[in-house]
């Protein structure tokens, strides 16, 4: 039984439009327990957006966020 489990943030699907980079405040990668890989971007308006980690723009944003950390 998974009693008292903390829900893990996964992605049902991904945004189909590239988010402007200046909207992004932070990101985190979804757990390996998720059925599909995902990157969740946190926007400056505190909205969370699921993105496809295999897309080039997603990899660039993640790299840039890491460099600026």
């Amino acid at each position: 039984s998974l009693a008292a489990d903390t829900p893990t943030a996964c992605c049902f699907s991904y945004t189909s439009r590239q988010i402007p980079q200046n909207f992004i405040a932070d990101y985190f990668e979804t757990s390996s327990q998720c059925s599909k890989p995902g990157v969740i971007f946190l926007t400056k308006r505190s909205r969370q957006v699921c993105a496809d980690p295999s897309e080039e723009w997603v990899q660039k944003y993640v790299s840039d966020l890491e460099l600026s950390a």
């Epitope: 992605c11 991904y14 969370q48 957006v49």
Partner: antibody
Framework: EVQLVESGGGLVQPGGSLRLSCAAS????????MHWVRQAPGKGLEWVGV???????NYNSALMSRFTISKDNSKNTVYLQMNSLRAEDTAVYYC??????????????WGQGTLVTVSS | SAEVTQPPSVSVSPGQTARITCSSN?????????ANWVQQKPGQAPVGLIG???ERPSGIPERFSGSSSGNTATLTISGAQAEDEADYYC?????????FGGGTKLTVL
């Protein structure tokens, strides 16, 4: 402000077809899933299906051979095409917005619904 | 095929705690079923209450909470109020589709 407005319901004969529309405003379909859910008179909610931002779909297996979900991102509108309609398809049909993250409410905003009546 | 079961009705006195359960015929209800709860008042469209087992959208009062343990997901309404009288539906995700329970009518006596 997020708003969902369904239209296209009405009276249709058994065996007929109908296309419902759900016009979304206050957000873009490119960042959200869109669900269709129906409710027969005096009954509970039944999930019909979903269309994802990229256009992929999943359906209630009992309905998928007759129902098709599509969308037009330029119009920010989702459609439910219903074919070979039966009396048991009589229901209020709702569209609902679906955030993509599993921890969030998966049908957070709902329209007011449109009534489909299948009768001869 | 998956079936989701809820009690048809639950009664509670104002200010008391109401619990509405949701079970699956496939076994344990886990966090991978992303249990969602929807409220529907008579003559109105449904409203999303709880998602991902226990996430509340803004505007939903804190007295509504969700949990999952073993075979059951539970919606808890702490300090039920007259305006909470409504039908409550549980929805569970099964890999590629949602299944709603039959709904529970909450009566606040």
């Amino acid at each position: 402000e997020v708003q969902l407005v369904e239209s296209g319901g009405g009276l249709v004969q058994p065996g007929g077809s109908l296309r419902l529309s759900c016009a979304a405003s206050g957000f873009s379909l490119t960042g959200y899933a869109m669900h269709w859910v129906r409710q027969a008179p005096g009954k509970g909610l039944e999930w019909v299906g979903v269309i994802w931002p990229g256009g992929g779909t999943n359906y209630n297996s009992a309905l998928m051979s007759r129902f098709t979900i599509s969308k037009d991102n330029s119009k920010n509108t989702v459609y439910l095409q219903m074919n070979s309609l039966r009396a048991e398809d009589t229901a209020v049909y709702y569209c609902a917005r679906g955030p993509l993250i599993t921890t969030e409410v998966s049908m957070d905003y709902w329209g007011q619904g449109t009534l489909v009546t299948v009768s001869s | 095929s998956a079936e989701v079961t809820q009690p048809p009705s639950v009664s509670v006195s104002p200010g008391q705690t109401a619990r509405i359960t949701c079970s699956s015929n496939t076994g344990a209800v886990t966090t991978s079923n992303y249990a969602n709860w929807v409220q529907q008042k008579p003559g109105q469209a449904p409203v999303g209450l709880i998602g991902g087992t226990n996430e509340r959208p803004s505007g939903i009062p804190e007295r509504f909470s969700g949990s999952s343990s073993g075979n059951t997901a539970t919606l808890t309404i702490s300090g039920a109020q007259a305006e909470d009288e409504a039908d409550y539906y549980c929805a569970l995700w099964y890999s590629n589709h949602w299944v709603f329970g039959g709904g529970t009518k909450l009566t606040v006596l």
